[in-house]
């Protein structure tokens, strides 16, 4: 669709700003109906109120929007555009309001934003473009630091035939928009893997957040351009054992945070080096909390106790001498 | 039974203004959004406004825009639309139409229509 | 603006014969999640009534004699057995954004 002329100054990915406009306009700065505004916050609250739509005329003052609770299903390019623009809006909380659909430059016209909280949504469609509104190979930088996506993957039956953490990663890599972030929250989404390409395409993240999840390993993923990680959660998730390479990567970011809690640990050979790093390392929260999951004899030794005598590997027998 | 009755309709000189209602019974107004699609003699469909349930959304044709002006009174489960500064291509029937949402719905129930005839 | 034609504008068909009419969007009005296509009968005299939504859903009370397929640009609305009530105007429908607009509209005619 094309711009119209009143609204020549937006890109055409917007259509719903031209026609987001009342014919009569509203008081400069009144509050929509089912919402609460208060200027002084700078707050507008439109919450638990099934809204199928982003109400038209939010007042010019909001830095603060919390939609959640509604029923909004699809956010369309341009969902937020307003003329004149949202120039101040930084907070946008959209969490539990039924979306299953970002559309393309869903996020437009918005160049104040700093936080996005999509959680708690069924994301069956999330565009590649959602975040950096182009299909350019380069976008134009967004103003996002804080995006926070806990809890978006649909029910199995809702899934499209394709992977969630690749649709996921499409979004946040897109254009190399996201280059300032500093927080991403991803927790709760059954993530099996991690692109390796993601977090080094993240560089300025602070903050990353995996935890409940069904990550196995972490082999593939990098970790060694994110200088300023200060938090990694890993919490609830499937890992079994730490190798090498990541404990060198995470030993060498110089103000990390590590949390394993609750994931279930192998305790045979190839941990040896996991336990060694973690009698010695300062960066992992709650080490001595970490035990074993397997094998059986060793369920809930913790893994800060166990010397290599206890971590054996049982030897691989020739076909001939193993048993059905 | 869903209901929707147009009514306001009738002849109006160019420059003029004329206000449409159309009253719902049937089911619950305010659960539902609503819009305005007219018919020129002869023609096809044409959408005119959009509201939403709670009057927190509103979207116009670019041909009506800063001229027709949608609202709607939940408490009387009635529907407006105001037009000033009537053309006479907006000489058309106008017909009140339900929605469950806007992008996801649909015009699942239709009134019978009103005529607006704008002629000098 | 999206654009819907359809084909053909007119049709005139025997009762008890198939009838197809086709809706070409100008874009693409789907996405993985939903199919924002729609398709309406106005019978002589009388406002529009939806037959079927989202391309392929018939809505409740329409004969299953017609039946909505397609997605992204190209959809189809068919009739397996013409019958006379069902004359008058076809027109599809998108809702991907704003404005909503129209197709032409196919007059189906009985021979």
């Known amino acids: 669709s094309s711009p119209t002329s009143s609204a020549s100054s937006f890109s055409s990915s917007a259509p719903f700003l031209a026609s987001a406009v009342s014919a009569q306009p509203p008081l400069p700065d009144q509050c929509p109906a089912l919402c609460e505004c208060s200027e002084a916050a700078r707050t507008v609250k439109c919450v638990n109120r099934n809204l199928t739509e982003v109400p038209t005329d939010l007042p010019a003052y909001v830095r603060n929007l919390f939609l959640t609770g509604n029923q909004l299903a699809v956010l369309p390019a341009g969902a937020f555009a307003r003329r004149p623009p949202l120039a101040e809006l930084a907070a946008l909380n959209l969490s539990g309001s039924r979306l299953d659909e970002v559309r393309a430059g869903a996020f437009e016209h918005l160049p104040s934003l700093r936080q996005l909280d999509l959680s708690h949504n069924p994301l069956a469609d999330l565009s590649p473009f959602a975040f950096s509104g182009s299909n350019a190979s380069v976008s134009a930088p967004s103003p996002l630091v804080e995006l926070i996506l806990n809890h978006i993957v649909p029910p199995e039956d809702e899934r499209q035939n394709r992977s969630f953490e690749g649709m996921v990663v499409a979004a946040l890599l897109a254009g190399r928009a996201l280059q300032g972030l500093r927080r991403l929250e991803l927790a709760s989404n059954h993530f099996l893997y991690l692109p390796r390409d993601v977090l080094a395409q993240l560089p300025s993240l602070r903050h990353l957040d995996l935890s409940n999840n069904s990550l196995v390993s972490l082999t593939y993923v990098s970790f060694r351009n994110l200088t300023h990680l200060e938090s990694l959660h890993l919490e609830d998730n499937a890992l079994k054992v730490l190798h090498n390479g990541t404990l060198a990567e995470l030993q060498g970011l110089p103000h990390i945070r590590v949390f394993l809690d609750n994931n279930p640990w192998v305790c045979d050979c190839h941990m040896a080096d996991m336990v060694t790093w973690l009698k010695e390392t300062e960066v992992v929260q709650g080490k001595d909390r970490l035990t074993c999951a397997y094998p059986e004899k060793m369920r809930n030794r913790v893994l800060l106790e166990l010397n290599s005598a206890d971590l054996d590997c049982d030897p691989i027998l020739p076909p001939s001498l193993q048993t059905s | 039974e869903v209901q929707l009755v147009e009514s306001g309709g009738g002849v109006v000189q160019p420059g003029r203004s004329l206000r449409l209602s159309c009253a719902a019974s049937?089911?619950?107004?305010?659960?539902?959004?609503m819009h305005w699609v007219r018919q020129a003699p002869g023609k096809g469909l044409e959408w005119v406004a959009y509201?939403?349930?709670?009057?927190?959304?509103?979207y116009y044709a670019d041909t009506v825009k800063g001229r027709f002006t949608i609202s709607r009174d939940n408490s009387k489960n009635t529907l407006y639309l105001q037009m000033n500064s009537l053309r006479a291509e907006d000489t058309a029937v106008y017909y009140c139409?339900?929605?469950?949402?806007?992008?996801?719905?649909?015009?699942?129930?239709w009134g019978q229509g009103t005529t607006v005839t704008v002629s000098s | 603006d999206i654009v819907l034609t359809q084909t053909p504008l007119s049709l005139s068909v025997t009762p008890g014969q198939p009838a197809s009419i086709s809706c070409r969007a100008s874009?693409?009005?789907?996405?993985?999640?939903?199919?924002?296509l729609h398709w309406y009968l106005q019978k002589p005299g009388q406002p529009p009534q939806l037959l079927i939504k989202?391309?392929?859903n018939l809505e409740s009370g329409v004969p299953d004699r017609f039946s909505g397929s397609g997605s992204g640009t190209d959809f189809t609305l068919k009739i397996s057995r013409v019958e006379a009530e069902d004359v008058g105007v076809y027109y599809c429908q998108h809702s991907w954004e704003i404005p909503l607009t129209f197709g032409q509209g196919t007059k189906l005619e009985i021979k």
């Open positions: 874009q693409s009005v789907s996405s993985s999640s939903y199919t924002y």
């Open positions: 989202s391309a392929s």
């Open positions: 049937g089911f619950t107004f305010s659960n539902f959004g």
């Open positions: 139409s339900r929605t469950n949402s806007l992008l996801r719905g649909f015009f699942d129930a």
């Open positions: 509201i939403s349930s709670g009057s927190t959304s509103f």
